[in-house]
């Protein structure tokens, strides 16, 4: 008698390695002899692809060589005429032992950047993935973490983080290890000693001495006056990492001493700078107890930076203040050339600004430091990039002994302006009063406005308070 | 996790001295400018004092200015507030809190995170 | 001293309601505002920095608006953990200051 299909061995889930052989049985009981069609993932499987054989009247698929793309759900449908066709479905779950499609490769990386080793896996279970670094497994913390790819990505890289590294991917079914690379840390150029400033007599002899260090060992030159030191000897010695300088000096004019600390990182140098006055006793009559005096600015580098007929701090603790500072400046604004176009009219302001402070008069003149604000703007916004470089070259801390040897103020070491409105200085080129911020200004013109974001109005500031728009 | 604890308060006679402390941790201590805000009981908020990261700047609010002295001791990640020649109406819960820049680098947030506060009861 | 006001004093609501507060300064600050949510025996809690930004983890039904020396704080949909008191606090210059706060209770 005419018998409808009925399907009498469900398909089951079927675990398959990469490579080997799949089987689907469909056992159907039915009179006259059924129909059996497959369908993966609800596409017809063609009787004549080669890739599977279809036996015992269709009851039987065998995937012949197992792929990873192979996986998903396999169907078969019987029909016969008697009745409606039935279906069974099973699924395909493709295994394979892990693999390392993307190997970490080898990496020279400058101390304090990120470093990202990849390690991109295939298989199935997913493998876990984890490092060794020389012949222990390493250990994540704070800093370093294997990213949910496999990558190892480590934060604020340091010298102790060199080393020879390989991942490794484990599953179920194996492990698989990459070749072992190398991360390679270089460090910028820092000086570790400056050399210090002296106040001596006609004639004297004086031993500037400057230490610094870096990966590379850095080589150190001296700048007097903002030229290559014409007189004097120099002695060098390196040792550990460090390199030791002394330029012996026979004094018969004040001078600015500058040591240069230069290493090569590829293609691009870091250089650290330190210097020091020279002063000549009976050429500097500073006003007792005072560190400096108000004057208006003289100089040409910052002219289109500072307010016009700016009242600007001059430090007497070097011997020709305003020839100083301009050279501090010049020597500056020369680093400045390499910086992005974005930064460089902002860092160029700050640095004016710094150098050359706004100044107080009153019986003890005083310098007015730029509002902390205005230097986060810079650093954060505007010199992102630039500015762990520009931070590697200058002396650490705010003033270092009491001269403003600065390239780059400390920020936190700043006033907030939302303390003391009158208490520190504005950049004036910056219109904080607005919020959709893009670029600073060139510096052309005496005082151009631009959009930046708003920080805190003053009563006494000389800056117009226009409406605030929140950033998006 | 970023926590701050007070402690030093207690009752104390008008005319006498206070000293409270506050402990932080789970943050760089050292990078932060702290501030004292206190809550007089069934009160509004005060501010206090303020203090930078470096110590630096410091201000108070008039109403305790000469009395008052905040300190910070970044070794040990610690606030202290004195409170001398204390008065009836300087009886508060007494908090410390953090300031901080928010993720631009240079907008400031207020009072970020604060203590649980501890009580100083100035009475005869 | 800029001196903050905060109106009303007392709000009284239900859940779900749309509830605004306002703070006046007496003098422009920008938008050197801050919001705080403080609930009995707890320290404030910062919800809103610089008058419309909204603080790291607090629900996106609050927000805040204004600048100069008129500002608000709205709460799209009260929720039960919103009944609590609300300070505004001017943060443009020392001595910086709070409004007297505004309590919101359930109807």
């Known amino acids: 008698l005419p018998k409808a299909p009925v399907i009498t061995t469900p398909l089951e889930t079927v675990d398959a390695l990469v490579e080997e052989v799949a089987t689907f049985m469909c056992a159907v009981e039915s009179y006259p002899q059924p129909e059996i069609s497959w369908t993966r993932n609800k596409i017809l499987i063609k009787l004549f692809d080669t890739r599977y054989s279809i036996r015992e009247n269709g009851q039987l698929l065998t995937i012949l060589s197992v792929e990873d793309s192979d996986d998903g759900i396999y169907c078969c449908t019987a029909n016969n005429g008697v009745g409606g066709a039935v279906e069974s479905c099973g699924a395909l779950q493709v295994k394979m032992k892990p693999k390392i499609t993307r190997p970490p490769i080898n990496v020279k990386i400058i101390e304090g950047l990120k470093a990202v080793l990849p390690c991109t896996t295939m298989g199935n279970p997913k493998p876990s993935v984890s490092w060794i670094k020389g012949d222990s497994p390493l250990r994540e913390n704070s800093r370093i973490a294997v990213l949910e790819s496999g990558s190892l990505r480590i934060h604020n890289v340091q010298k102790e983080d060199a080393g020879q590294y390989r991942c490794v991917a484990k599953n179920s079914l194996g492990t698989a290890y990459s070749k072992v690379v190398k991360l390679e840390v270089e460090v910028f150029a820092r000086i570790l000693r400056a050399p210090e400033s002296h106040n001596v007599t006609f004639g004297s002899f004086v031993t500037l001495h400057c230490t610094a260090t870096g990966i590379p060992v850095p080589t150190i030159t001296w700048i007097e006056n903002g030229n290559a030191v014409s007189s004097g000897s120099i002695q060098e010695s390196v040792k550990d990492r460090v390199i030791d300088s002394r330029l012996q000096l026979f004094i018969t004019k004040p001078g600015l001493y500058t040591c240069i600390a230069t290493n090569k990182h590829g293609e691009k140098f870091s250089t650290a700078k330190a210097a020091a006055t020279i002063s000549i006793a009976e050429w500097s009559k500073p006003q007792k107890d005072n560190k400096g005096y108000c004057a208006q600015y003289r100089g040409e580098v910052c002219n289109a930076v500072l307010a016009k007929d700016a009242l600007v701090f001059l430090n007497t603790s070097y011997a020709d203040p305003e020839e100083a500072q301009e050279l501090l400046v010049h020597t500056a604004w020369n680093e400045l050339k390499v910086v992005s176009p974005v930064c460089r009219p902002a860092a160029e302001a700050l640095l004016c600004n710094h150098i050359f402070q706004e100044c107080s008069p009153g019986v003890v003149p005083t310098p007015i430091p730029i509002c902390r604000e205005y230097c986060l703007a810079v650093k954060e916004l505007f010199c992102a990039k630039e500015w762990l470089v520009m931070e590697e070259k200058t002396h650490r801390g705010l003033y270092r002994s009491e001269m403003h040897l600065l390239s780059v103020p400390e920020c936190s070491k700043l006033p907030s302006m939302h303390w003391d409105p009158t208490a520190c200085a504005r950049l004036p080129h910056l219109d904080y009063n607005k919020e959709n911020l893009k670029t600073f200004p060139p510096m052309t013109s005496s005082k151009p406005s631009v959009d930046i974001p708003n920080l805190p109005s003053s009563s006494s500031s000389s800056f117009s308070v226009s409406p605030t728009y929140s950033m998006t | 996790e970023v926590q701050l604890v007070e402690s030093g308060g207690g009752l104390v006679k008008p005319g006498g001295s206070l000293r409270l402390s506050c402990a932080a941790s789970g943050f760089t201590f050292s990078s932060y400018d702290m501030n004292w805000v206190r809550q007089a009981p069934g009160k509004g908020l005060e501010w206090v004092s303020s203090i930078s990261s470096s110590s630096s700047y410091i201000y108070y609010a008039d109403s305790v200015k000469g009395r008052f002295t905040i300190s910070r001791d970044n070794a040990k990640n610690s606030l202290y507030l004195q409170m001398n020649s204390l008065r009836a109406e300087d009886t508060a819960v007494y908090y410390c809190?953090?300031?901080?820049?928010?993720?631009?680098?240079?907008?400031?947030?207020?009072?970020?995170?604060w203590g649980q506060g501890t009580l100083v009861t100035v009475s005869s | 001293d800029i001196q903050m006001t905060q109106s009303p004093s007392t709000l009284s609501a239900s859940v779900g309601d749309r509830v605004t507060i306002t703070c006046r300064a007496s003098?422009?600050?920008?938008?050197?505002l801050a919001w705080y949510q403080q609930k009995p025996g707890k320290a404030p809690k910062l919800l809103i920095y610089k008058a419309s930004s909204l603080e790291s983890g607090v629900p996106s039904r609050f927000s805040g608006s204004g600048s100069g020396t008129e500002f608000i704080l709205t709460i799209s949909s009260l929720q039960p953990d919103d009944f609590a008191t609300y300070y505004c606090q001017q943060y443009n210059s020392h001595s910086w200051t709070f409004g007297q706060g505004t309590k919101v209770e359930i109807k």
């Open positions: 003098q422009s600050i920008d938008n050197w």
């Open positions: 809190a953090r300031d901080s820049y928010d993720s631009s680098g240079y907008y400031l947030r207020p009072f970020d995170y």
